[in-house]
């Protein structure tokens, strides 16, 4: 849930929890789910070509809670939503990417910054 | 105290189906993931696999999936695990056992004995 | 699977002796979250085995202090400073980083 552009990390479970991965799977993972003492995340960012990429996981516990705040980054178009509830929950998330800001457009091929 | 109560033995004929239980009580059920481990003499301990109550999610060993079934009663903070088309390599002692990052309670075991 | 190798098989020891027990495992046991975990239990005859050691190091409620475990990546090691009549039994190691968990052979730990 966002609240003045940020979300806030849920509660870590006293259990391991099991989360889908795509794009972002540890070794240790097995058929796609990872496992972790934190959160599940989805993330969806602009590759260097503009398009949207998905990428889900685990988050350790470890650095976690600022990781999934999702505080903005200029001139990067990033979301990441993250979970704890049960097991893969975050097969349910849906993060979209945040709008555009003016200066962010461009008139031709060439990226001003 | 964490207790996890198992019968102590099933005797089944070969080719039938069992239903071990495992009664929890002294903690929350839900707030820990449930594993059965098969020791068989001189065979050491194998993990066949975890069931989490809160929302029934399983996780299985290759080798037992199609033998071993999970499942949990979060009304009576029991868990089960079926196991089906019995043979005598079957025959070993099953024990629950507690898990959050890692087994800390076990159940005492029940002995499983599959013979005609 | 992750093998989990563990040695000696049998372990005579006098009591009041120090006792060490090795476990190596297949591949290394730092998971993803960077905690190691590798545990250590003790099975007596007919009983359910007791967690005495958890994530390598950490003593679980009520295990004498005289029980420690050690080590990093695949190689790990169980002591026993001062053995006691009831220390005896079987020792195990086991992982529950890498799906399927596994568990070592166990070491007796017996009388000489």
């Known amino acids: 849930k966002k609240e003045d552009g940020e979300s806030t990390a849920p509660t870590p479970r006293p259990k391991i929890l099991r989360c889908k991965c795509h794009h972002h799977c540890p070794e240790d993972s097995v058929n796609n789910i990872c496992s972790t003492d934190g959160y599940c995340f989805t993330m969806i960012e602009e590759d260097d070509s503009g398009m949207p990429v998905v990428t889900s996981g685990c988050l350790g516990l470890e650095g976690s809670d600022f990781q999934c705040r999702d505080t903005p980054i200029p001139h990067q178009r990033r979301s990441i939503e993250c979970c704890t509830e049960r097991n893969e929950c975050n097969k349910d998330l849906h993060p979209t990417l945040p709008p555009l800001k003016n200066r962010d457009f461009v008139d031709g091929p060439i990226h001003h910054k | 105290q964490v207790q996890l109560q198992q019968p102590g033995a099933e005797v089944v004929k070969p080719g039938a189906s069992v239903k071990l239980s495992c009664k929890a009580s002294?903690?929350?059920?839900?707030?820990?993931?449930m594993q059965w481990v098969k020791q068989r003499p001189g065979q050491g301990l194998e993990w066949i696999g975890e069931i989490d109550p809160s929302d029934r999610y399983t996780m299985y060993n290759q080798k037992f999936k199609g033998k071993a079934t999970l499942i949990v009663d979060t009304s009576s903070s029991t868990a089960y695990m079926q196991l089906s088309s019995l043979t005598s390599e079957d025959s070993a002692v099953y024990f629950c056992?507690?898990?959050?990052?890692?087994?800390?309670?076990w159940g005492q075991g029940t002995t499983l004995t599959v013979s005609s | 699977d992750v093998v989990m190798t563990q040695t000696p098989l049998s372990l005579p020891v006098s009591l009041g002796d120090q006792a060490s027990i090795s476990c190596r495992s297949s591949?290394?046991?730092?998971?993803?979250?960077?905690?190691?975990?590798l545990h250590w239990y003790l099975q007596k005859p007919g009983q359910s085995p007791n967690l005495l050691i958890y994530k390598v190091s950490n003593r679980f409620s009520g295990v004498p202090d005289r029980f420690s475990g050690s080590g990093s990546g695949t190689d790990f090691t169980l002591k026993i400073s001062r053995v006691e009549a009831e220390d005896l039994g079987v020792y195990f190691c086991?992982?529950?980083?890498?799906?399927?968990?596994?568990f070592g052979s166990g070491t007796k730990l017996e009388i000489k």
């Open positions: 086991s992982q529950s980083t890498h799906v399927p968990f596994t």
């Open positions: 002294g903690y929350t059920f839900t707030n820990y993931w």
């Open positions: 591949q290394s046991l730092v998971h993803s979250t960077g905690n190691t975990y």
């Open positions: 056992a507690r898990f959050g990052y890692y087994v800390d309670y």
